[in-house]
C-alpha cells in the first residue's frame, strides 16, 4: 500500500457568472474553498480503484472535480464519462503534486453520472471514480411554523413540517415597534423548539433550511397598549391552529382576564393562563385562546376582557383558501433624474407572500412591512433611475399576483447617428419622447440652419428595451444633399441634442456632436 500514491480528491463549488458555459479548465468564476471528498481505495475491487464521496450538485451550479496525486514522476490521464473519452491535462502544483481537474459548468441532468479518471504514473495505474448527481430539491419544503401547547406544561412548542428538517428558533423582543427589527440589540434568539418565557412583548418563531426562512408571530392583544384605529385582523385557513395571546399588566394581582368569541365565553380547554411578577413588582397576566384545528365557525370577534383594563378585540377570519388582495392595474411614473422615488404595492394576503421585484430580467429581493390596518406594503427604491418596466410578483401557497410599473426618467435627449449609402439615421432615448429636425450645412448655411423636410421619416418608438422607448428619425439620401454635412437634432422640454453626419459614401460618419441646451 505504501507504493500506492497518496490521492486527494476535492470538490470546488463555483459561484456562477452568467457568462460561463460549456466545459473548460480555465476558471471564469469565483470559487469557494475546496471540499475534501475522502478519496479511498474501494474495498474488494479488482485493480486499484479509488472512490470519492458521492457529489450532489444543484441544477445550474458549476463545480470542479479535482484530484491531487502525490506520486513521483510524470503522470498521464484520461477522463471517461458515459463511454466518451474526455481530454485530460495534468499540471503540477507548488508542492509538486499532479493536479487533474474536470470542470462541470451549469450542471444539468445530462452531466450527472459516473466520471472515471484513469491515471498512469511511472509506478502504477489506477482509477478514480466520482459519482455526481443532481440535488433533488423538488422534495424540499419549507412550511411556516405553527404553535402547539406542550403537554402538561405552560410552554409553547414551535413546529415546522419541512424537508430537510429545519432549524427552529424563537425570536423574542421586549421593546416596542421599530426596535424589534431582526438585527436590533433588543432582539434575543433562542435556537430551540420549546419556549417557556411567554411574557415578552413580541414573540416569533422562525424555521430555516436550504429553501430559506419562514416565521410566524404569536398574535397578541396588549390591554395596556392603546388599541389600533382599525380592528386587528387574523386570517387562518381551515384546519390550521389558532393562537391569540392576551396580555395585561397591573399594579397588583387583583385582576382577571377572560376570552369571549362573539360575546360567548370560550370553552374550557380552549384557553390557559399564566402569570408572573415583573421586576417592578407589578403583576403580568397572559391568557391564551387556542383552537388546535380551526373550522369556519371559529370565525368572529375574539374579545379579551379584564376587570381592570378596557377590553380589546380581534377579528379572526377563517378562509378555505389563501389569497392575495391588491390592485393589479399597471402604473406609470415620470420622475426627474435625481428625484427620490420608490415603487410601492399595498396588499392584504394570507398566508404571507414570497415576492420579488424584477427589472431587465434581474430579480431583486423584496421586503414587506405590515401596516396597522392589516395591510402590508412592499417598496422598491433600488431602481438607480433606470427607465423601463418593473414587475412586482408575489405568491403564497394558494395565490399569485403580478403588477407592472413603468418608470420614465425626464431627461434631455442624447443622439446617436449612423449612415448608409442610401440613408442617415439618428436615435435618441430622452424623455418625454423627443421631436426631430434635420438641417443641411452648406456655403449658404454654414451654421446649418437650412431645414430639410423632404425624405424625413420619424418613428416615435421603434425599439423597446425592457420598457425603455427609443425614438428614431431617418433621412433618405437625395442628390440635393449628397456630399453635404447634415445635422439631426432631437429636442424635448428639457433640451436639444444634435449629431452631424457627412453624407458621401457608405459607412457611419458621425462627425461632430453639438449639445445645445
Amino acid at each position: 500500500n505504501q507504493d500506492l500514491p497518496v490521492i486527494k480528491c476535492v470538490l470546488i463549488n463555483h459561484k456562477n457568472n452568467d457568462s460561463s458555459v460549456g466545459k473548460s479548465s480555465s476558471y471564469p468564476m469565483v470559487s469557494e474553498s475546496p471540499e475534501d471528498l475522502g478519496c479511498a481505495l474501494r474495498p474488494q475491487s479488482s485493480g486499484t480503484v479509488y472512490e470519492a464521496a458521492a457529489v450532489e450538485v444543484d441544477v445550474s451550479a458549476s463545480i470542479t472535480l479535482q484530484v491531487l496525486v502525490d506520486a513521483p514522476g510524470n503522470i498521464s490521464c484520461l477522463w471517461v464519462f458515459k463511454h466518451s473519452s474526455l481530454n485530460c491535462q495534468p499540471h503540477f502544483d507548488l508542492q509538486n503534486r499532479g493536479v487533474v481537474s474536470m470542470v462541470i459548468l451549469k450542471m444539468t441532468e445530462t452531466q450527472a453520472g459516473e466520471y472515471l479518471l484513469f491515471i498512469q504514473s511511472e509506478a502504477t495505474n489506477y482509477t478514480i471514480l466520482f459519482t455526481v448527481s443532481i440535488r433533488n430539491t423538488l422534495l424540499y419544503t419549507l412550511r411556516r411554523p405553527y404553535f402547539r401547547k406542550m403537554e402538561n406544561q405552560d410552554a409553547l412548542v414551535c413546529i415546522s413540517e419541512s424537508v430537510p428538517e429545519p432549524i427552529v428558533e424563537w425570536v423574542l423582543c421586549d421593546s416596542q415597534g421599530e426596535s424589534c427589527k431582526e438585527e436590533s440589540p433588543a432582539v434575543v434568539k433562542k435556537e430551540e423548539k420549546v419556549l417557556h418565557e411567554l411574557f415578552g412583548t413580541d414573540i416569533r418563531c422562525c424555521a430555516r433550511n436550504e429553501l430559506g426562512r419562514e416565521c410566524t408571530r404569536l398574535f397578541t392583544i396588549d390591554l395596556n397598549q392603546t388599541p389600533q384605529t382599525t380592528l386587528p385582523q387574523l386570517f387562518l385557513k381551515v384546519g390550521e391552529p389558532l393562537w391569540i395571546r392576551c396580555k395585561a399588566v397591573h399594579v397588583n394581582h387583583g385582576f382577571g382576564l377572560t376570552w369571549e368569541l362573539e360575546n360567548k365565553a370560550l370553552e374550557e380547554g380552549n384557553y390557559f393562563e399564566m402569570s408572573t411578577y415583573s421586576t417592578n413588582r407589578t403583576m403580568i397576566r397572559i391568557l391564551f385562546a387556542f383552537v388546535s384545528s380551526v373550522a369556519r365557525n371559529d370565525t368572529g370577534y375574539y374579545t379579551c376582557s379584564s376587570s381592570k383594563h378596557p377590553s380589546q378585540s380581534a377579528l379572526v377570519t377563517i378562509v378555505e383558501k389563501g389569497f392575495i388582495n391588491a390592485t393589479n392595474s399597471s402604473e406609470d411614473y415620470e420622475i426627474d433624474q435625481y428625484e427620490e422615488f420608490c415603487f410601492s404595492v399595498r396588499f392584504k394576503a394570507y398566508p404571507q407572500i414570497r415576492c420579488t421585484w424584477t427589472f431587465s430580467r434581474k430579480s431583486f429581493p423584496c421586503e414587506q412591512k405590515g401596516l396597522d390596518n392589516g395591510y402590508s406594503i412592499s417598496k422598491f427604491c433600488n431602481h438607480k433611475h433606470q427607465p423601463g418596466e418593473y414587475i412586482f410578483h408575489a405568491e403564497n401557497d394558494d395565490a399569485q399576483f403580478t403588477k407592472m410599473f413603468t418608470l420614465n426618467i425626464r431627461r434631455k435627449p442624447q443622439v446617436l447617428a449612423e449612415a448608409s449609402a442610401s440613408q442617415a439615421s439618428c436615435f435618441s432615448d430622452g424623455y418625454p419622447l423627443p421631436s426631430w429636425t434635420w438641417k443641411k450645412c452648406s456655403d449658404k448655411s454654414p451654421n446649418c440652419t437650412e431645414e430639410i423636410t423632404e425624405g424625413v421619416w420619424n418613428r416615435k418608438a421603434n425599439r423597446k428595451v425592457f420598457g425603455q422607448w427609443v425614438s428614431s428619425s431617418t433621412l433618405n439620401m437625395s442628390e440635393a444633399i449628397k456630399g453635404f454635412l447634415v445635422k439631426c437634432c432631437a429636442y424635448n422640454s428639457l433640451g436639444t441634442s444634435c449629431e452631424t453626419i457627412l453624407l458621401n459614401s457608405p459607412g457611419p460618419f458621425p462627425f461632430i456632436q453639438d449639445n445645445i441646451s
Epitope: E35, A53, L129
Partner: antibody, heavy 124, light 107 residues
C-alpha cells in the same frame, strides 16, 4: 486540509444541559453523503459512539442515551452541535467528533478524520 | 445492539514481533468493520476499513482480515511507534459499537 474541532464547556454541573460544537473545515455537510458522529471516552475507558448526522439530516442515536441527546447542524453546514440533557458525573469523558464519508457506489467510510477531543467534567 | 469482544485486552511484545489482535461480533456484520489506533492523550486514527482495506498512508505492516463475526488485525513486525491501544468498530447496524480495546505494551 480536513479538520474537526470540538468546543464546549470543560465543567458542567449535574442535571444541567451540555452543548458541544464540532467545527468542520476542509469539508462540509453540504455534500450528498457526508456525516459527522460524536464519540466519547471516559478517562481510561472504552470508546462509546453517541450519535451521528448526515447532510440530508438523517440522524441516529445511541440506544441507551437517545432520550438525552439531540444532534443538529447549522445552516452553513460547517458546525455540528450535540446537546446532552440532565448530565451526571458518569458523563465525564473526552468527547470527539469524527467524519463519515458516503461513497457513490453505496459504501460508507467511518471516522477517517477525528477532532482532537474535548474533556468535559461533570461535577457539582 | 451488536457486542464487539476484543481479545486480548492487553499484550506485551517486543520490536519486530508479529502481533495479532482479534475482534468477535455477537452477530454477523459482513465486512463492516474498522480498526483504529489510539495513543495516550490523542484521538484515534483509522488503520483499516472494510475489514481488510489499508488506510492510505498507513504502513503495510498493518493488515486486516475476516468477515462475518471473526476479525483479525495483524502487525507483521512491531515498530516502536506501534505501542498503543487498538480498537475495532462495527458499522453494520445502529448503534455503532466499539470493542473495548487491546493495549499493546513493550515487553
Amino acid at each position: 486540509q480536513v479538520t474537526l474541532k470540538e468546543s464546549g464547556p470543560t465543567l458542567v454541573k449535574p442535571t444541567e444541559t451540555l452543548t458541544l460544537t464540532c467545527t468542520l473545515s476542509g469539508f462540509s455537510l453540504n455534500n450528498a453523503r457526508m456525516g459527522v458522529s460524536w464519540i466519547r471516552q471516559p478517562p481510561g475507558k472504552c470508546l462509546e459512539w453517541l450519535a451521528h448526522i448526515f447532510s440530508n439530516d438523517e440522524k441516529s442515536y445511541s440506544t441507551s442515551l437517545k432520550n438525552r441527546l439531540t444532534i443538529s447542524k447549522d445552516s452553513s453546514k460547517t458546525q455540528v452541535v450535540l446537546t446532552m440533557t440532565n448530565v451526571d458525573p458518569v458523563d465525564t469523558a473526552t468527547y470527539y467528533c469524527a467524519r463519515i464519508v458516503g461513497y457513490g457506489s453505496g459504501w460508507y467510510g467511518f471516522f477517517d478524520y477525528w477532532g482532537q477531543g474535548t474533556l468535559v467534567t461533570v461535577s457539582s | 445492539d451488536i457486542q464487539m469482544t476484543q481479545s486480548p485486552s492487553s499484550l506485551s511484545a517486543s520490536v519486530g514481533d508479529r502481533v495479532t489482535i482479534t475482534c468477535r461480533a455477537s452477530q454477523g456484520i459482513r465486512n463492516d468493520l474498522g480498526w483504529y489506533q489510539q495513543k495516550p492523550g490523542k484521538a484515534p486514527k483509522r488503520l483499516i476499513y472494510a475489514a481488510s482495506t489499508l488506510q492510505s498512508g498507513v504502513p503495510s505492516r498493518f493488515s486486516g482480515s475476516g468477515s462475518g463475526t471473526e476479525f483479525t488485525l495483524t502487525i507483521s513486525s512491531l515498530q516502536p511507534e506501534d505501542f498503543a491501544t487498538y480498537y475495532c468498530l462495527q458499522h453494520n447496524s445502529y448503534p455503532l459499537t466499539f470493542g473495548c480495546g487491546t493495549k499493546v505494551e513493550i515487553k
